[in-house]
């Protein structure tokens, strides 16, 4: 079934998303909103998908995203046994066969149809910034996060020496 925006919405059955023999350790369906409670929505326009950050009308249902969680070894793990090195990475898919991807050259976040295995640009390191806010760091470009810029998603460089709590890279996940 297609929603108002023209993006086929997930039903209860989560689609298969194993990659290169690695399965996600868990999956969840959630709507994504900004720190300021604007919704992240997805629309089909001219045969390509656009991502918007907008205030939702009361009667409009929030778009759901399938988050698939993967374990990964941290590249800077000091110990060879993996004790220090576990991170959680996620992929975000608002519709079957399409995933959010980082375009590091354009500093943009795009929705692309992908063949498996998924490219590294589709993986984001998960950060819990607070009790109910998360951030998504590019696997391919540490220190660069999905953020909000001019009512669109963009890639934003964060200086680790500063407080990482800047609101434009904070998102809320809700069922």
């Amino acid at each position: 079934a297609f929603g108002i925006s023209g993006v086929p919405k997930y039903t209860r059955a989560l689609h298969d998303s194993s990659i290169t023999g690695i399965s996600p350790i868990t999956e969840s369906l959630a709507s994504l909103s900004t720190y300021n409670d604007q919704s992240i929505t997805f629309a089909l326009e001219d045969e390509s998908y656009e991502i918007y950050v907008e205030d939702l009308k009361k009667d409009k249902k929030k778009d759901k995203v399938l988050l698939s969680y993967y374990e990964s070894q941290h590249p800077s793990s000091e110990s060879g046994d993996g004790v220090d090195g576990k991170m959680l990475m996620v992929t975000l898919s608002p519709t079957k066969d399409f995933w959010l991807q980082a375009n590091n050259k354009e500093h943009s976040v795009e929705l692309h149809k992908c063949e498996k295995p998924l490219p590294d640009q589709a993986f984001f390191v998960l950060h819990n910034r607070s009790f109910n806010c998360v951030s998504f760091e590019c696997k391919t470009d540490p220190g660069v996060f999905i953020g909000v810029k001019d009512n669109h998603l963009a890639l934003i460089k964060v200086d680790y020496s500063e407080n990482l709590g800047s609101e434009n890279i904070l998102f809320k996940l809700s069922e």
Partner: antibody, heavy 121, light 106 residues
Framework: EVQLVESGGGLVQPGGSLRLSCAAS????????MYWVRQAPGKGLEWVAA????????YYPESVKGRFTISRDNAKNSLYLQMNSLRAEDTAVYYC??????????????WGQGTLVTVSS | DIQMTQSPSSLSASVGDRVTITCKAS??????LDWYQQKPGKAPKLLIY???NLQTGVPSRFSGSGSGTDFTLTISSLQPEDFATYYC????????FGGGTKVEIK
Amino acid sequence: EVQLVESGGGLVQPGGSLRLSCAASGFTFSSYWMYWVRQAPGKGLEWVAAITPNAGEDYYPESVKGRFTISRDNAKNSLYLQMNSLRAEDTAVYYCARGHYYYTSYSLGYWGQGTLVTVSS
Amino acid sequence: DIQMTQSPSSLSASVGDRVTITCKASQNINKHLDWYQQKPGKAPKLLIYFTNNLQTGVPSRFSGSGSGTDFTLTISSLQPEDFATYYCFQYNQGWTFGGGTKVEIK
């Protein structure tokens, strides 16, 4: 090897204060959520405090809110729990615990051996 | 606050038995649930995370299942070293432990 060593427990009178410490080693302390969990004698586990990697946010259950304060010193790889206005029901073994993953608040992957706090007159 | 109700609070079993412990959340917690094992005088140890993922080094006789509000820990064939207390723990909204299940020798 991940190590968490608690200290600072002991006997304190009701209304008194105590500061617990947890010395961490064997991992990148500044990248992990950290927690305090307690266990009263013969009872179950109770989460009592949590703190984000950069110490920007801290969280408590209603049972200790306003009396306990969690803090951390990433330069010293140390976690603390300041306990004020202690009550008899705060008597417990207090465990320091580390998040399972870098950066996330999911799961308590490693635990210290605990330090006993006894509140009694 | 989310409440976690664990049952039974205690059970007696023999070596080789299949043991099942359940945990019920007061509201949907997705799969944000762990199981911990604690032996007398020792710190708890993470057994299973995100409902069904075995922590490194944990024997495959332990398994977890469930989603939403109902969760299960199963020990397929109880071994002498498995006599302990088991706790469920949710981290979907805040952090809450279940009351514990003591597995004793019959």
